[in-house]
């Protein structure tokens, strides 16, 4: 007889990214005997909660916990049962829970609080509802792109640990509250806050990163319409030819858009507002969400944050990701440089309506905001972070590194359940030279 | 009331070219789009690319690229498919389909069909 | 690459309820179309828009769409709703339509 060899035993993690506008659950799954490998944890499975983000239950706390049901249901068919007990459960809450917390710190404890009621229900080892930081969102951001990719070590035909000579990747994420920018920097950073140190299988890595929240699609998306109302009764980013009513309450319940709130308005009204198809008014409607007059340091890209000069190579994910893929799958339009990527927000932004439409058949419920939200993208990443076309060559922009969705939630993970080392292991257990 | 005819049933060698015509009688193109599908013995529908003739766009399944061309004369109402390199899996009834702005673009009207038989 | 996937058959007594699903990866996130095609003819659309009905097609028709599956409702089956039905999205990330692979409906009795 002959032995057979057991295919090695998984492990399991759950993360619930419970972002602005949704929740989505990924379950990752690595082999337990090669959990210090780089690029050894890989997404297993996910799944969209319905509906909104959590925050969008403060009125009715118990439905957030109540609309990640489904998905956990999901989990548990999922992840073997005799795996349930072992395998960590987080949720991780982003710039939509930031922001209720500026202006109900009641209701964003009770919302925390009906999750976590809804998560200890389930068979799963569940380390908390939290939170995170800006910082942590962009630093886990760009964790995860970098393990996904390989950048952090390589294994050696000698049995040890060698690192690589590639360097890491920038990571840029665009979510519906907030948008972070992380990359390794060898300059010191003129602001404590932008500065995170890691130690990861053994190297140093100094990072620059930043947060800043109301520059999320969504919220963008809300400061951009109260603009409109106030400056234009028009909006030139929409498409000639469609109009919609606003309800003025949602428009001005966001603190991304306290600043633009008339001193009294009907909260119950509602406005008309029709899209005129104006690249260049919404070009400039758009720049001033940015301000680029005042820096109190050396260097700094908008708003007086301080950043270094981008360096290296950049992956850009989530609404980077779909946005720009739309400007090229649908619109059939080149993006490869920032001229060329100008071009193609102002020839979309100059559509109307009804051509819009025909080139996007069967769908219709972001497609007004595409004109805008390319604006903003092309405006951030040369005006705001700096990228000319020399250092823009420089970024990729995907949604998935290693069949792997890119984002903070992996990275998160990884730091929670100690699977990158901070120093080299030692000697390679079973390696052998004959 | 606008309807979609068809050129003629084809033959065709493997390796060669067919190109199969779409009329709309009774219209034009104006605001409207038209896909082509086809659909092989047995199975089910497969869509292979689109024209917006008023705004001159084309988009093609990936599957297809490189080997389905799409045009559109506007004159004559008349939109064309031509898909080259044929080889036998391409026997199938090559439906043009009209795309509605009524109905967000989707296919209301349809033609009977274009059977294109692939043999040696 | 996205894809849209219907039972192969469906049978429904005659007088009854029918429902044919189709799923995909958040549907309910897109628009959905159902078309009906009988033995030797084009299809015919019958429902647009989740749960909208063309002029012409009965009210027996109906749609929904939520999460990961659409749903063609035909209530009151009769033998002239045998055919085959096939959803359809499009697919934003690839720029194309998908179709489901087909349901053959059955109307028994």
């Known amino acids: 007889t002959q032995d057979v060899r057991e295919p090695p035993a998984l492990k399991y993690g759950i993360v619930l990214d419970a972002g602005s506008s949704h929740t989505s659950m990924f379950v990752y799954k690595w082999p337990a005997d090669k959990e210090n490998d780089t690029g050894i944890v890989g997404q297993h499975s996910s799944c969209d909660v319905r509906g909104g983000g959590i925050s969008s239950y403060a009125n009715d706390p118990s439905r957030a916990g109540q609309s990640l049901v489904e998905c956990l249901e999901q989990a548990l068919r999922d992840v073997p049962k005799d795996r349930y007990a072992s395998t960590p459960l987080y949720l991780g809450a982003t710039a939509g829970m930031r922001l209720l917390n500026l202006t109900s710190p009641e209701a964003t404890a009770k919302v925390l609080e009906a999750v976590t009621q809804t998560l200890t229900r389930y068979p799963f080892d569940f380390r908390g509802a939290r939170i995170l930081s800006g910082q942590d969102e962009g630093v886990f951001g760009w964790v995860t792109a970098n393990y996904l990719l390989e950048n952090f070590i390589k294994y050696g035909w000698v049995g040890r640990w060698i690192r690589p000579r590639k360097g890491t990747l920038g990571a840029m994420d665009l979510g519906g509250a907030s948008t972070q920018i992380t990359f390794e920097t060898t300059s010191p950073s003129e602001d404590p806050d932008n500065e995170v140190h890691l130690r990861l299988y053994g190297q140093h890595y100094r990072v620059y990163t930043h947060s800043f929240l109301c520059y999320g699609r969504d919220q963008v998306l809300q400061r951009l319409l109260a603009s409109a109302l106030q400056i234009h009764r028009f909006h030139p980013c929409w498409p000639k030819g469609y109009s919609t009513q606003v309800l003025l309450r949602e428009v001005y319940q966001s603190p991304c858009t306290m600043g633009q709130r008339p001193q009294t308005f009907n909260s119950s009204a509602t406005v008309s507002l029709s899209g005129t198809s104006n690249a260049a008014l919404c070009r400039d409607l758009v720049s001033g969400l940015f301000n680029i007059s005042s820096c109190p340091f050396s260097q700094c890209s908008f708003n007086g944050v301080f950043q270094p000069p981008v360096a290296g190579n950049f992956i850009a994910f989530s609404a980077f990701y779909y946005t720009v893929d739309f400007l090229k799958t649908v619109m059939g339009l080149p993006v490869g440089t920032l001229k060329q990527l100008e071009d193609a927000t102002e020839t979309t932004c100059n559509q109307t309506w009804a051509e819009l439409q025909a080139r996007v058949p069967g769908q219709q419920t972001r497609l007004p905001d595409y004109c805008a939200v390319a604006m903003f993208i092309h405006q951030l990443l040369s005006r705001g972070y700096r990228f000319d076309e020399r250092s823009f060559r420089g970024v990729v922009f995907e949604k998935k590194a290693a069949d792997t969705a890119v984002g903070w939630a992996l990275g998160y993970m990884l730091n929670l359940t100690n699977l990158i080392p901070a120093d080299l292991p030692g000697l390679r257990k079973g390696t052998h030279f004959s | 009331q606008v309807q979609l005819v068809q050129s003629g049933a084809e033959v065709k060698k493997p390796g060669s070219s067919v190109k199969v015509s779409c009329k709309a009688s009774?219209?034009?193109?104006?605001?409207?789009?038209v896909s082509w599908v086809r659909q092989a013995p047995g199975q089910g529908l497969e869509w292979m690319g689109r024209?917006?003739?008023?705004?001159?766009?084309?988009r093609y399944a990936q599957k297809f690229q490189g080997r389905v061309t799409i045009t559109a004369d506007e004159s004559t109402s008349t939109a064309y498919m031509e898909l080259s390199s044929l080889r036998s899996e391409d026997t199938a009834v090559y439906y043009c389909?009209?795309?509605?702005?009524?109905?967000?673009?989707?296919?209301?009207?349809w033609d009977q069909g274009t059977l294109v038989t692939v043999s040696s | 690459s996205y894809e849209l996937t219907q039972p192969l058959s469906v049978s429904v007594a005659l007088g009854q309820t029918a429902r044919i699903t189709c799923s995909g990866d958040?549907?309910?996130?897109?628009?959905v179309y159902w078309y009906q095609q009988k033995p030797g003819q084009a299809p015919v659309l019958v429902i647009y828009?989740?749960?909208n009905r063309p002029s012409g097609i009965p009210e027996r028709f109906s749609g929904s769409n939520s999460g990961n599956t659409a749903t063609l409702t035909i209530s009151r089956a009769q033998a002239g709703d045998e055919a085959d039905y096939y959803c359809?999205?499009?697919?934003?990330?690839?720029?194309?339509?998908?179709f489901g692979g087909g349901t053959k409906l059955t109307v028994l009795g």
């Open positions: 389909a009209r795309e509605s702005p009524g109905y967000r673009y989707s296919f209301d009207v």
């Open positions: 009774g219209g034009t193109f104006d605001s409207y789009a």
């Open positions: 024209i917006v003739p008023w705004l001159g766009f084309t």
């Open positions: 958040a549907i309910g996130e897109k628009y």
């Open positions: 828009d989740d749960n």
């Open positions: 359809a999205s499009y697919d934003l990330q690839q720029a194309r339509w998908v």
